[in-house]
């Protein structure tokens, strides 16, 4: 293991951390159990504890960004560096930022949590096996309503466990419908939309109306982020997979790799490729936020870099489902802060 | 021991082009970040380029559009293609190499320089 | 963008005095801030960083001080190679930028 220079720590053991902004790539729940989970593995094994707080005077303050962000280290876009953070002190110092422009995940995929269906909102797992068919993102497959859903084990066929996946014909968010499924067609501004728009938007929030109507009624919401079928790269990032669409006069209800020759899964944007060529790559395993947290608090606690591989400090990221801190790990914090003490013995107490 | 050693400078007129490389030698060139940082004659630093690991760039407004930082890990080398140039840009061009890499930040400033190479534009 | 602005711009005293160099950031930078020495002809050469560190081989009479928008450069005893220019470089925002530099000269 390695410290920063001069040893810097935090001189007090209670510290407290902000989240400041989320990111879109998961439900904030699931951000907020990473986080914390993150600081877990460094409580467990020294006298430190974290104390979420909503205040920008915390220690460690957690923010999302992208390129330049408000500090003398501008991200660079996906992959390459994915995270950064800065020694502990005051200020800025022990703050802990996350490059947006990475897919955040929990390293196995989008987290797409499921509502309704026989699951109990566990989130969906991908790929999984329908009708002998591999599935990579929430499909509408085997069902006449139009709703997206998908399974929340590997193999629908055997498991028959699934849920409905967040789509504007289940329900919108905020908004000033209560959460009611979008209407389509709907009319805005004399127009007929028939999918959801940024129409009358500048922050570029999809939204629809949940009447046929909005210039008469003005009810809207806000349509789900759809991570699983968001593209990236080719020429039309951030725009949604289109189910089923058609490449080479061939029908696809999930994306697929055909016509590459690197194995990378891909979708049209609109239903058919072969006649608007708009497409893009969809989304892949993402990086563990949990993992990529857990290596920024480590600096943010005083860690420098590892040159042990298989520890958590090592300054390249692996996923792995395993205990993520090495005993380097542990033996570089303990270093910093010593070890957690052990409870206080108890008397024996006699009936 | 650590060298940075630049070298295709020289005159060139106003609208001109020239390629500036800058070989490097002595540490893990592929894991650091890379700067080229001027000096007009008699004046003070001005930095115009960084590269990351990554390949990912920025610029100095005074040169964005017409400059290009590139680096080839394989040969351990950083150039900085300048096009359009103009009688502004006269200065002696030094390549840097950040003292630390990756994800912990501090500012911890440009550990070493080449020597510089002279670009004069005039006509 | 903040501007850095070095103080005195000539610095006139005689080998074994003190100097003080002044930088003075025009917004909080916390500690992002390196101090290069540059004689004519050559290359700048890193000589504090992260504001109070020593860059390896400086001799220990160079010193840094300082957070947030001011920051001293502190020669204790001066040498005779110590006459040179002194530049600061901030790092706190992007973009990064330098100085306008210090003359140190002798007297």
């Known amino acids: 293991f390695q410290t920063f220079e001069g040893d810097l720590k935090w001189h007090h053991h209670n510290i407290t951390y902000w989240i400041q902004n989320y990111s879109e790539d998961l439900p904030r729940a699931v951000i907020d159990d990473a986080f914390a989970r993150a600081f877990a593995l460094w409580s467990a094994v020294t006298p430190l504890t974290f104390t979420r707080v909503y205040s920008r005077d915390a220690d460690i303050v957690i923010q999302f960004g992208v390129a330049e962000h408000g500090d003398g280290y501008p991200f660079d876009g996906k992959d390459g560096l994915l995270a950064h953070a800065f020694p502990p002190g005051p200020g800025i110092q022990g703050d802990a930022h996350f490059d947006d422009d990475e897919l955040w995940s929990l390293g196995k995929g989008v987290v797409v949590p499921t509502r309704f269906g026989n699951a109990d909102g566990a989130a969906c797992h991908f790929p999984f096996i329908f009708e002998g068919r591999s599935y990579s993102a929430c499909t509408t497959d085997g069902r006449s309503d139009g709703l997206p859903w998908c399974s929340t084990t590997a193999n629908y066929d055997t498991d028959d466990r699934f849920g409905f996946c967040p789509s504007e014909r289940l329900y919108t968010q905020d908004g000033n419908a209560d959460g009611k499924p979008c209407q389509f067609p709907f009319i805005f501004q004399g127009q007929s939309y028939s999918a959801c728009t940024t129409d009358g938007r500048s922050d570029g929030y999809r939204w629809c109306a949940t009447t046929a109507n909005y210039d008469r009624d003005k009810l809207f919401g806000f349509c789900p982020t759809r991570a699983d079928s968001t593209v990236m790269g080719g020429n039309s990032a951030g725009e949604l997979c289109v189910f089923p669409f058609t490449f080479l006069g061939k029908e696809y209800s999930t994306c697929t790799s055909e016509g590459r020759g690197d194995g990378r899964l891909w979708c049209a944007t609109t239903s058919n490729f072969d006649s608007d060529k708009k497409w893009g790559f969809c989304p892949d395993q993402g990086y563990s936020l949990f993992l990529v947290a857990a290596h920024e608090f480590g600096h943010a606690l005083g860690l420098d870099h590892s040159s042990v591989p298989e520890a958590l400090m090592y300054p390249m990221y692996r996923f792995t489902e395993g205990p993520p801190l090495h005993k380097d790990d542990v033996n570089g914090i303990r270093h910093l802060y010593g070890p957690r003490p052990e409870p206080e013995p108890r008397p024996p107490t006699t009936t | 021991e650590v060298q940075l050693l630049e070298s295709g400078g020289g005159l060139v007129q106003p609208g001109g082009s020239l390629r500036l490389s800058c070989a490097a030698s002595?540490?893990?060139?592929?894991?650091?970040d890379m700067w080229w940082v001027r000096q007009a004659p008699g004046k003070g630093l001005e930095w115009v380029s960084v590269i990351y690991p990554s390949g990912t760039t920025f610029y100095a407004d005074s040169v964005k559009g017409r400059f290009t930082i590139s680096r080839d890990n394989s040969k351990n080398t950083l150039y900085l293609q300048m096009n359009s140039l103009r009688a502004e840009d006269t200065a002696v061009y030094y390549c840097?190499?950040?003292?630390?890499?990756?994800?912990?930040?501090?500012?911890?400033?440009?550990?070493?320089w080449g020597q510089g190479t002279l670009v004069t534009v005039s006509s | 963008e903040i501007v850095l602005t070095q103080s005195p711009a000539t610095l006139s005293l005689s080998p074994g005095e003190r100097a003080t160099l002044s930088c003075r950031a025009s917004?909080?930078?916390?500690?992002?801030l390196a101090w290069y020495q540059q004689k004519p002809g050559q290359a700048p050469r890193l000589l504090i960083y992260?504001?109070?560190y020593r860059a390896t081989g400086i001799p220990a009479r160079f010193s840094g001080s300082g957070s947030g928008t001011d920051f001293t450069l502190t020669i204790s005893s001066l040498e005779p190679e110590d006459f040179a220019v002194y530049y600061c470089q901030q790092r706190g925002n992007w973009p990064i930028t330098f100085g306008q530099g210090t003359r140190l000269e002798i007297k």
């Open positions: 992260d504001a109070s």
């Open positions: 840097a190499k950040d003292r630390a890499y990756g994800d912990y930040v501090g500012w911890n400033g440009f550990d070493y």
């Open positions: 002595g540490f893990t060139f592929s894991q650091y």
């Open positions: 917004q909080s930078i916390s500690s992002f």
